[in-house]
């Protein structure tokens, strides 16, 4: 039995920040769970972890230097990533693991979300030509 995960196919981080919502076919509220976000086709980089236990506060952390926060919904976890760099444009995969009560459950691999990080471009003020002199 696997949990199904839905993610947006693509998100654009215009201001170097993005909200990525992972929607699960499973209610997490009465479970001890570990939701994580992974970067790359091979999911090699664990970007952010949200650890939840119904009786305690959420724990959110990154061991890979990402600036992240997380919020829990009934059947979703939203990862808020900030201070992203252009070179962190990549595909990101949501993962969910239900640790307790048993049995252990995890998800079918999702299609992932391409996060396109747009660099901050300072737009110069348009130059208006002054009054023409004879």
């Amino acid at each position: 039995n696997k949990i199904l995960v839905k993610q947006s196919p693509m998100l654009v981080a215009y201001d170097n920040a993005v909200n990525l919502s992972c929607k699960y076919s499973y209610n997490l509220f009465s479970r001890e769970f570990r939701a994580s976000l992974h970067k790359g086709l091979d999911s090699a980089v664990e970007v952010c972890v949200v650890y939840g236990n119904y009786s305690q506060q959420l724990q959110v952390y990154s061991k890979t230097g990402f600036n992240c926060d997380g919020k829990l919904g009934n059947e979703s976890v939203t990862f808020y990533l900030q201070n992203l760099y252009v070179n962190q444009t990549d595909i990101y995969f949501c993962k969910i693991e239900v640790m307790y009560p048993p049995p252990y459950l995890d998800n079918e691999k999702s299609n992932g979300t391409i996060i396109h990080v747009k660099g901050k471009h300072l737009c110069p003020s348009p130059l208006f030509p002054g009054p023409s002199k004879p």
Partner: antibody, heavy 116, light 107 residues
């Protein structure tokens, strides 16, 4: 879930009740135990997970009930010790199913009557 | 531990009538609640899980509602086979306490 037959026991004695599972993978489901005393309501005793031998007890039944299992026979056991008239009841086992993150007990044994 | 307060403890109603049984908890259980029917000498039967979801095969005259700390089981057009005891049970951590039960008698 097939439960063992009725038991008539003396005060202070112990008894072991069994709950034999069939028709599903034994190690993938939690088994709960519930007590029903005559004229009273259902009382939750605890649960046992055969996959990892995880156990949860109601604090009220710690020292009274001990849950174990035998994977080879797909059977969960509950031993009750130091029996008194208060332990005279029907004891049910029930399988916990996970409905996408919500729990319930859809499958129950027929119950075992214990008379002290 | 979560306390379950079920009411009424008993009620006597006529066939065709509608009854509502309520279950209150002392803290939010986020709809992690089930309802069971038990007839004399039989095992309990699951009617509703997740507070509102009807189990397959259970007549549609049974319905569950509620959220937070207050939940209800409603039986419309009561039939003679609906007599027996009804229990709520929470699954918000352990112990998975049952309500005290409601004895439903047919007038």
């Amino acid at each position: 879930l097939q439960q063992s037959g009725a038991e008539l026991v003396k005060p202070g004695a112990s008894v072991r009740l069994s709950c034999k599972a069939s028709g599903y993978t034994f190690t993938e489901y939690i088994i709960h135990w519930i007590k029903l005393r005559s004229g009273q309501g259902l009382e939750w005793i605890g649960w046992f997970y055969p996959g990892s031998n995880d156990i949860q007890y109601n604090a009220k039944f710690k020292g009274k009930a001990t849950l174990t299992a035998d994977k080879s026979s797909s059977t969960v056991y509950m031993e009750l010790t130091g029996l008194t008239s208060e332990d005279s009841a029907v004891y049910f086992c029930a399988r916990r199913d996970d409905f996408s993150g919500y729990d319930a007990l859809p499958y129950w044994g027929q119950g075992t009557m214990v008379t002290v | 531990d979560i306390q379950m307060t079920q009411s009424p403890a008993s009620l006597s109603v006529s066939v065709g009538e509608t009854v509502t049984i309520t279950c209150r908890t002392n803290e939010n259980i986020y709809s992690n609640l089930a309802w069971y029917q038990q007839k004399q000498g039989k095992s309990p039967q699951l009617l509703i899980y997740a507070a509102t979801h009807l189990v397959e095969g259970v007549p549609s005259r049974f319905s569950g509602s509620g959220s937070g700390t207050q939940y209800s089981l409603k039986i419309t057009s009561l039939q003679s086979e609906d007599f027996g005891n009804y229990y709520c049970q929470h699954f918000w951590g352990t112990p998975c306490t049952f309500g005290g039960g409601t004895k439903l008698e047919i007038k």
